[in-house]
């Protein structure tokens, strides 16, 4: 797995470089996670044809994966920094159960899956420090998450492959939207 941001050899070799600002650190963290997702998607798409055929193969997707909407204030039109930040943090917290599901779903990229999960936890911490209105952030119910995880893990192989593909695709889209929004803050 790649080395987490701030721990690569270049950072060690350049001790006089200015320390990263909070925004730069968040930006770097998201890009690191996106790199990890790309590697996981590569394995998923090589293993099955889910990536090409997911649209035709599904009538309905009730996974409730977090998604950015106009009301969340993260798009250029109607941009609202505080509302958007709350949405990003809430969304990442909601994604955590799906990232837990991804563990043990990969053969050659097992470390990568763990790195994505742990890096997301760190990203949430960075963002929580940045947020002023932490009370507005709702944490998912652990009991609900546990039963969802059980249900997802009980699916057959084909459905598990499809679930994996959909989680990675949605998480990538969510992080890309978050990255664009955070660059406006």
């Amino acid at each position: 797995a790649p080395v987490p941001p701030g721990e690569d050899s270049k950072d060690v070799a350049a001790p006089h470089r200015q320390p990263l600002t909070s925004s730069e650190r968040i930006d770097k963290q998201i890009r690191y996670i996106l790199d990890g997702i790309s590697a996981l998607r590569k394995e998923t798409c090589n293993k099955s044809n889910m990536c090409e055929s997911s649209k035709e193969a599904l009538a309905e997707n009730n996974l409730n994966l977090p998604k950015m909407a106009e009301k969340d204030g993260c798009f250029q039109s109607g941009f609202n920094e505080e509302t958007c930040l709350v949405k990003i943090i809430t969304g990442l917290l909601e994604f955590e159960v799906y990232l837990e599901y991804l563990q043990n779903r990969f053969e050659s990229s097992e470390e990568q899956a763990r790195a994505v999960q742990m890096s997301t936890k760190v990203l949430i911490q960075f963002l929580q420090k940045k947020a002023k209105n932490l009370d507005a952030i709702t944490t998912p119910d652990p009991t609900t998450n546990a039963s969802l995880l059980t249900k997802l893990q009980a699916q057959n192989q084909w459905l598990q492959d499809m679930t994996t593909h959909l989680i990675l695709r949605s998480f990538k889209e969510f992080l890309q939207s978050s990255l664009r929004a955070l660059r406006q803050m």
Epitope: L58, E60, L63, M162
Partner: nanobody, 124 residues
């Protein structure tokens, strides 16, 4: 486990109607998305229609849209397929399938439980 038993197949003339039934037993029926697939001789099993858990939403293959209607009665643990304006190309073995998943598939591999099938023959 879930057991599925189809009935209602038979021989019908082109333009005629049939109503297939699928009786389920075993688990909580209302938790399952229920689908109908069909397989003509020498062809792959193909999606016909699916109904969501509570029966609120239905989806159909383009080839049967407007002619076939899927419905369910959770009190009777039964799913139905009303087939109208039948055509010779509708001739096939019709299977009922069930799955308990947040994903509702149109692909046969997205289903865990299958019936034995009921034969529908459309011929003059």
């Amino acid at each position: 486990d879930v057991q599925l038993v189809e009935s209602g197949g038979g021989v019908v003339q082109p333009g005629g109607s049939l109503r297939l039934s699928c009786a389920a037993s075993g688990r909580t029926f209302s938790n399952y998305a229920m689908a109908w697939f069909r397989q003509a001789p020498g062809k792959e099993r193909e999606f016909v229609a699916v109904i969501s858990y509570a029966g609120g939403r239905t989806y159909y293959a383009d080839s049967v849209k407007g002619r076939f209607t899927i419905s369910r009665d959770n009190a009777k643990n039964t799913v139905y397929l009303q087939m109208n304006s039948l055509r010779p190309e509708d001739t096939a073995l019709y299977y009922c399938a069930a799955v308990d998943s947040p994903l509702i598939a149109t692909h046969p591999r997205g289903y865990d439980y299958w019936g034995q099938g009921t034969l529908v023959t459309v011929s003059s």
